[in-house]
């Protein structure tokens, strides 16, 4: 049987059940390389409390559909008196990066995971030439996820004192220049994730090969190498390589630019101080507030919730968007869709789509940007579920009793962007991280 998601085959992936202190290793095309789980384990459970290993999915006992992968085992389990077998179930959804498998829940018999990934899309529009896993768990099983830094179009400029060259990078995947035919970036060779531009020439100095690594709790490393044979004439016989070290800052701060810290014979060392390198619980919340010892900040957007069936309305030229954030009130137009953001076509109000659901909510504060994300909306033709990204700005003089109002700024591949100026986005900082 052919592997259902070949892009995911090259790596052993990790997921964590934080509540029970369990680490899962997943290899969807072969077997994980863990002796204690046996030679054919596709999903291996490592219970860190009891220091035991169990195979909870056998690579030989795999069954697949376009959106579901199941690995059975021969191990019996007792579920309400019936004799079942232990199994793992991975539900796949279309995403814009390779993504990460997320542990959902486990019963006595079934271990459930969900994975939003380009590999599950109906169309190839989000697929990279080359992409590697962009997250890692530290020794305390805390997740560090750089997926939000991945640029689907364009690149980051590395801060470098050399006026004659420009070094462009992407994170964990190659640089796509198709949206900007006019700039210097256009000359970058396909597949490159680190592109050096000198004058009118552009050179591939690194492609992603291995996934993100953790070197210390707050330092993550990504390495790019030039795959192509044939040396560049300005590299003194060496093969180019790029090492990017992502550093979690010691306290809350605005984002910084990736900086070139060393360069020798086409070996480029870059340091990037960014809160995205911090563990995810420091940056994100599933509620509409971020506060407490762990986050170093106090943010509470819950006053923006609308009661009594009213919604915020944002004009999107062809569409009207109805928003009801930080609550579970149904939007009338999107009845029974559990939508936090509802898209209604002006010319035909029967055309209604959920652009993100209220139980699929993430509040993120990172590098000075406060963002509320709603995902899991109605599917687009690519298979990608519509989502909405609301970028908040602090405005102490916002109208509507300080609440302000969301403004639609545009849509990119079924992701809808809004900005929202409100006094409730004014962040209060604590200093003890």
């Amino acid at each position: 049987q052919a592997a259902p998601f070949p892009e995911l085959c090259s790596y052993t992936w990790e997921a964590v059940d934080t509540k029970n202190n369990v680490l899962y290793k997943i290899n969807i095309c072969g077997s994980v390389d863990i002796v204690q789980c046996g030679p054919s384990s596709a999903v291996c459970e490592h219970d860190l409390k009891t220091r035991t290993y169990h195979s909870v999915g056998d690579s030989v006992l795999r069954s697949a559909t376009r959106s579901l992968l199941e690995f059975n085992t021969t191990v019996s389990c007792d579920q309400q008196g019936t004799n079942h077998r232990v199994q793992s179930s991975i539900a796949f959804l279309c995403g814009k990066t390779l993504g990460t498998p997320e542990f959902v829940t486990a019963t006595e018999c079934v271990h459930y995971f969900e994975w939003r990934t380009t590999a599950a899309c109906k169309k190839d529009i989000f697929k990279a030439n080359k992409e590697v896993p962009c997250y890692v768990f530290d020794e305390e099983l805390r997740k560090h996820d750089l997926n939000p830094l991945i640029k689907l179009s364009g690149a980051y400029l590395v801060d470098d004192s050399d006026p004659d060259t420009s070094l462009f990078i992407n994170v964990c995947r190659d640089i796509d220049t198709l949206r900007d035919p006019g700039s210097q970036l256009r000359a970058c060779p396909p597949g490159t994730a680190a592109c050096l531009v000198r004058g009118h020439q552009a050179f591939d100095v690194g492609q992603p090969r291995d996934g993100l690594k953790v070197v210390r709790k707050d330092r993550l490393v990504l390495s790019y190498v030039r795959e192509e044979a044939g040396k560049l004439d300005f590299c003194d016989g060496h093969s180019p390589a790029v090492t990017i070290t992502f550093v979690c800052p010691s306290e809350r701060r605005e984002g910084t630019i990736p900086k070139l810290t060393a360069k020798s014979n086409c070996r480029y060392e870059i340091e990037w101080i960014t809160e995205y390198a911090c563990h995810r619980d420091y940056l994100e919340s599933k509620t509409c507030s971020l506060s407490g010892e762990q986050q170093d900040v106090s943010i509470d957007l819950t006053p923006l919730a609308q009661s009594g069936g009213s919604s915020y309305i944002s004009d999107g030229k062809e569409y009207l968007f109805y928003l009801n954030v930080c609550g579970e009130t149904e939007i009338q137009f999107c009845n029974k869709k559990q939508a936090a953001v509802c898209q209604v076509k002006k010319s035909d109000t029967s055309q209604v789509k959920a652009a993100g659901r209220y139980h699929n909510q993430t509040l993120r504060y990172s590098d000075g940007d406060l963002t509320l994300i709603y995902f899991g909306g109605d599917e687009c033709s690519s298979g990608f579920q519509r989502m909405s990204v609301i970028n908040f700005e602090c405005n102490k003089t916002a109208g509507n009793d300080g609440k302000g109002t969301p403004v639609f700024t545009g849509e990119v591949d079924c992701t809808y962007f809004f900005t929202w100026d409100t006094e409730y986005a004014c962040v209060h900082h604590h200093h003890h991280h």
């Epitope: 462009f168 006019g182 849509e411």
Partner: nanobody, 123 residues
């Protein structure tokens, strides 16, 4: 590719103010970072100000800090440059530009450009 059209230039006395606008059409507003540049006769095109697409983060050339403000109205797909306390040395053609490169102020990293609008500051 995005198309850009500047307006708002003109002749103004030293110490006066102008507000430049740049309307974007074509490709979606949301994937770009935006910049204002200027070019005086016989000089290189130079960076003035920039704003990131994903937030309202801004950066300015030292020569205009405290006097110029870049902003945007996402609903109108328009970028603005509010210029106060103008000086004769601010005389130039002002260009609006869009880039898919984050953290850049280099004109060669901007792939889409407007036609420019003339600003003349008399003493």
């Amino acid at each position: 590719q995005v198309q850009l059209q500047e307006s708002g230039g003109g002749l103004v006395q030293a110490g006066g103010s102008l507000r430049l606008s740049c309307e974007a059409s074509g490709r979606t507003f949301n994937t770009y970072n935006w910049g204002w540049f200027r070019q005086a006769p016989g000089k290189e095109r130079e960076f003035v100000a920039a704003i990131r697409w994903s937030s309202s983060k801004t950066s300015y050339a030292d020569s205009v800090k405290g006097r110029f403000t870049i902003s945007r109205d996402n609903a109108k797909n328009t970028i603005y440059l509010q210029m106060n306390s103008l000086k004769p040395e601010d005389t130039a053609v002002y260009y609006c530009a869009a880039s898919i490169v984050d953290f850049t102020t280099n004109p060669s990293h901007f792939g889409s450009w407007g036609q420019g609008t003339q600003v003349t500051v008399s003493s």
